[in-house]
């Protein structure tokens, strides 16, 4: 089948890093500079992605693979293949249309990206707050002291308060 296919389509013999040049009798020609083909049998090479501005090159373009970009310090990638760079904020903040804003009380963000999320509601799991939440950290849930003891002090109720001027019998 492979042999039959190659007889019908000589371009299928062109490996990655080349293209099937119609102008040269379907000879396999190497991709020109700043272009690549990642699969065989291609009739054109794709233009290499250029990492400019807020983007920086993470991996150079080669004849068989596209360049890969990431973001310059102070920014982070968004989208498939880092199609966008978004400004970092500090932990305890989120990015709004007006820039970085502190998380509202009761919410936190432990990363430099993303939105502020509500603190965990420990009581939903029947637990109590062991460590309070902050803008940067979620609460830590755990048992309340009552989970470790049924209570001992009920054995001895507090002594009744004496009225002034009365001595104990």
């Amino acid at each position: 089948f492979e042999r039959t296919r190659s007889l019908q389509d000589p371009c299928s013999n062109c490996p990655a890093g080349t293209f099937c040049d119609n102008n040269r009798n379907q000879i396999c020609s190497p991709c020109p500079p700043n272009s690549f083909s990642s699969a065989g049998g291609q009739r054109t090479c794709d233009i290499c992605r250029q990492c400019k501005g807020v983007f920086r090159t993470r991996k150079e373009c080669s004849s068989t693979s596209n360049a890969e970009c990431d973001c310059t310090p102070g920014f982070h990638c968004l989208g498939a293949g880092c199609s966008m760079c978004e400004q970092d904020c500090k932990q305890g903040q989120e990015l709004t249309k007006k820039g970085c804003k502190d998380c509202c009380f009761g919410t936190f963000n432990d990363q430099k990206r993303g939105i502020c999320r509500p603190w965990t509601n420990c009581s939903l799991d029947g637990k109590s707050v062991l460590v309070n939440g902050t803008k940067e950290r979620d609460v830590v849930c755990g048992p309340s002291p009552a989970d470790l003891s049924p209570g001992a002090s009920s054995v001895t109720p507090p002594a009744p308060a004496r009225e002034p001027g009365h001595s104990p019998q």
């Epitope: 109590s128 309340s144 002291p145 009552a146 470790l148 049924p150 209570g151 002090s153 507090p158």
Partner: antibody
Framework: DVQPQQSGAELVRPGASVKLSCKAL????????MYWVRQTPVHGLEWIGA????????AYNQKFKGKATLTADKSSSTAYMELSSLTSEDSAVYYC?????WGQGTTLTVSA | DVVMTQTPLSLPVSLGDQASISCRSS???????????LHWYLQKPGQSPKLLIY???NRFSGVPDRFSGSGSGTDFTLKISRVEAEDLGVYFC?????????FGGGTKLEIK
């Protein structure tokens, strides 16, 4: 911080009394009992008693009745233990705890 | 008083080994409310005890999952699946079902 904060080391004379303090942190002091425990190389960990700051209720290990008196001040979230008629046998590290977290301990040395 | 008996007294291990500590009580630790108030603590030199496991088998916040507790009634076990250097110290079992609350004598986990 959530670890109870205890008063510093004490060096006292035999026959004297001492009052140790324990400040609760990170939870509602009046809702739960505070316990006192002592540790010695000979007897290991020994439970002295409990106080419920909300109700004022107390419970004592029979061994420490008359030796220890537990009180609490709700306004400062602080529990106290007074130890009286001290002897060298009372030299120990004394801990307060709500069982999840323990204070750092107060070292009591009774010596002439 | 409820007597808590821990075995062994000393447990020499190699790092990465499994360790198992037994705790037996002189009477059942099942409370009338159905809960079993048996807890495990680790005490490192110069520090206060730290809670590892509460109510037989519940890992406390931040305690690695290599620690597990099991048992019922009067017979309880603490297992450490792969001992790490930070696990070395003295392990205590403790019961808070019956007043006075009591503690085991401790098991020292040390390097072989």
């Amino acid at each position: 911080d959530v670890q109870p904060q205890q008063s510093g080391a004490e060096l006292v004379r035999p026959g004297a009394s001492v009052k140790l303090s324990c400040k609760a942190l990170g939870y509602t002091f009046t809702d739960y009992e505070m316990y006192w425990v002592r540790q010695t190389p000979v007897h290991g960990l020994e439970w002295i008693g409990a106080i419920h700051p909300g109700s004022g209720g107390t419970a004592y290990n029979q061994k420490f009745k008359g030796k220890a008196t537990l009180t609490a001040d709700k306004s400062s979230s602080t529990a106290y233990m007074e130890l009286s008629s001290l002897t060298s046998e009372d030299s120990a590290v004394y801990y307060c705890t709500e069982l999840r977290y323990w204070g750092q301990g107060t070292t009591l040395t009774v010596s002439a | 008083d409820v007597v808590m008996t821990q075995t062994p007294l000393s447990l020499p291990v190699s790092l990465g080994d499994q360790a198992s500590i037994s705790c037996r009580s002189s009477q059942s630790l099942v409370h009338s409310n159905g809960n079993t108030y048996l807890h495990w603590y680790l005490q490192k030199p110069g520090q206060s005890p730290k809670l590892l496991i509460y109510r037989v088998s519940n890992r406390f916040s931040g305690v690695p999952d290599r620690f597990s507790g099991s048992g019922s009634g009067t017979d309880f076990t603490l297992k450490i699946s792969r001992v790490e250097a930070e696990d070395l110290g003295v392990y205590f079992c403790s019961q808070s079902t019956h007043v006075p609350y009591t503690f085991g004598g401790g098991t020292k986990l040390e390097i072989k």
